[in-house]
């Protein structure tokens, strides 16, 4: 592949002019240790609006791995196990904060970035537009 | 608001012993400007597993405000608009990164923290345990 050298413009941590900069300790504290175990269940399969998960990888982002949901159907699964197109499977999206290496390839310099991720799907009643 | 005094133990940004520390520019870049406007839609009301959103606020966290979903019903809304208890409304949870001021009250020093948030709700078929 193409060799991308370390960016010579990587800022020095002592640079007082680096805009609105803070120090962040990346040793992550996990507040989730005693949370409800249901969070790691198989809702993605049992939902009436089931979804698949895809590994979204971006090495210039921290975290570099985010799992993204994609709804399996346009409609929702009915009581008979068939897809009902009178209802819609839609992604539930959330805006999350990530760190983006800036300048690129700098190991110790990041910028906060907001990205939108699909977390799962829900079944909604469609909005019906009546034509006069 | 309440004035939180600067903690005298706030680390110096030049402190090379501050563990696994990086510089982060807090001028947020928003990648979501051209995303689907449906994300800010009324899915929470139109879903067969509707939810309410509650404001979770923590001044020692960045972002300080996070909106958390709570399912309105144990069951799901059926075609007649009634709650069907043969199905379950469940929260879809996601692990997200936030910045936690560390030491507390320091304006320029944070630690990454993983927290679990409920983003919305989905309707699932219950797991039925048959008693022999």
């Amino acid at each position: 592949g193409i060799t991308i050298p370390r960016n010579p413009g990587c800022p020095n941590s002592e640079d007082k002019n680096f805009p609105r900069t803070v120090m962040v300790n990346l040793n992550i504290h996990n507040r989730n240790t005693n949370t409800n175990p249901k969070r790691s269940s198989d809702y993605y399969n049992r939902s009436t609006s089931p979804w698949n998960l895809h590994r979204n990888e971006d090495p210039e982002r921290y975290p570099s791995v985010i799992w993204e949901a994609k709804c399996r159907h346009l409609g929702c699964i009915n009581a008979d196990g068939n897809v009902d197109y009178h209802m819609n499977s839609v992604p539930i999206q959330q805006e999350i904060l990530v760190l983006r290496r800036e300048p690129p390839h700098c190991p110790n310099s990041f910028r906060l970035e907001k990205i939108l991720v699909s977390v799962g799907c829900t079944c909604v009643t469609p909005i019906v537009h009546h034509v006069a | 608001g309440i004035t939180i005094p600067r903690n005298p133990g706030c680390p110096n940004s030049e402190d090379k012993n501050f563990p696994r520390t990086v510089m982060v520019n807090l001028n947020i870049h928003n990648r979501n400007t051209n995303t689907n406007p449906k994300r800010s839609s009324d899915y929470y009301n139109r879903s067969t597993s509707p939810w309410n959103l509650h404001r979770n606020e923590d001044p020692e966290r960045y972002p300080s405000v996070i909106w958390e979903a709570k399912c309105r019903h144990l069951g799901c809304i059926n075609a007649d608009g009634n709650v069907d208890y043969h199905m379950n409304s469940v929260p879809i949870q996601q692990e997200i990164l936030v910045l936690r001021r560390e030491p507390p009250h320091c304006p320029n020093s944070f630690r990454l923290e993983k927290i679990l948030v409920s983003v919305g709700c989905t309707c699932v078929t219950p797991i039925v345990h048959h008693v022999a």
């Epitope: 060799t3 992550i28 790691s40 993605y44 590994r55 990888e57 090495p59 570099s64 | -």
Partner: antibody, heavy 119, light 107 residues
Framework: EVQLVQSGAEVKKPGASVKVSCKAS????????FHWVRQAPGQGLEWIGV????????AYNQNFRDRATLTADKSTSTAYMELSSLRSEDTAVYYC????????????WGQGTLVTVSS | DIQMTQSPSSLSASVGDRVTITCKAS??????VGWYQQKPGKAPKLLIY???NRYTGVPSRFSGSGSGTDFTFTISSLQPEDFATYYC?????????FGQGTKLEIK
């Protein structure tokens, strides 16, 4: 104590399939990605793919996409790697390993399962 | 795919020696490089992550450095239990790739 215990050695004929298991204990199985890596005799390490037991998501090395299938059974905290259409060059030790996505490393490994493909 | 070129492929040294192994990535991988030790018939063991961070319980004689494309792994004073094969590995982007290994033998 975190432990990953793999199934025993297998001998298969070319064209057959093999399914290797990896049972996890000592931590919450659904919290971490599971990766599979193989090592042919006297050779280096080759990444096969990843499964996240918590959400069922998978991703594969292109070289294995058509032949490898990764699954996980949450009720038994066991991950599986199935490899089909076996050929002699698939003879290798297959390892499961836990990956910490935020930290970016494989911290615990199974003891390895030797799969021999021979007619 | 990112190639990790490790050198030397084998190395003879004595107890107490200082040993250095290098790894070159085919493109920048920032600091997303780990070093593993493997003994015959055993699984690899993590020693260094993020190029220079020692994993829990790893003795201080093991160290790593580098960023971008060039990485170095050093054992400051070889101990008898250190004779093994060492691998570098990038987790910058999948497919995650390993160096071909350096076999460290007793002189």
């Amino acid at each position: 104590e975190v432990q990953l215990v793999q199934s025993g050695a297998e001998v298969k004929k070319p064209g057959a399939s093999v399914k290797v298991s990896c049972k996890a204990s000592g931590y919450t199985f659904t919290d971490y990605e599971f990766h599979w890596v193989r090592q042919a005799p006297g050779q280096g390490l080759e990444w096969i793919g990843v499964i996240h037991p918590g959400n069922g998501g998978t991703a594969y090395n292109q070289n294995f996409r058509d032949r490898a299938t990764l699954t996980a059974d949450k009720s038994t905290s066991t991950a599986y790697m199935e490899l089909s259409s076996l050929r002699s060059e698939d003879t290798a030790v297959y390892y499961c390993t836990r990956f910490l996505t935020y930290e970016g490393y494989f911290d615990y490994w199974g003891q390895g399962t030797l799969v021999t493909v021979s007619s | 795919d990112i190639q990790m070129t490790q050198s030397p492929s084998s190395l003879s040294a004595s107890v107490g020696d200082r040993v250095t192994i290098t790894c070159k990535a085919s493109q920048s991988v920032s600091i997303d490089v780990g070093w593993y030790q493997q003994k015959p018939g055993k699984a690899p063991k993590l020693l260094i992550y993020h190029a220079s961070n020692r994993y829990t319980g790893v003795p201080s004689r093991f160290s790593g450095s580098g960023s971008g494309t060039d990485f170095t792994f050093t054992i400051s004073s070889l101990q008898p239990e250190d004779f093994a094969t060492y691998y570098c590995q990038q987790d910058y982007s999948s497919p995650y790739t390993f160096g071909q290994g350096t076999k460290l033998e007793i002189k």
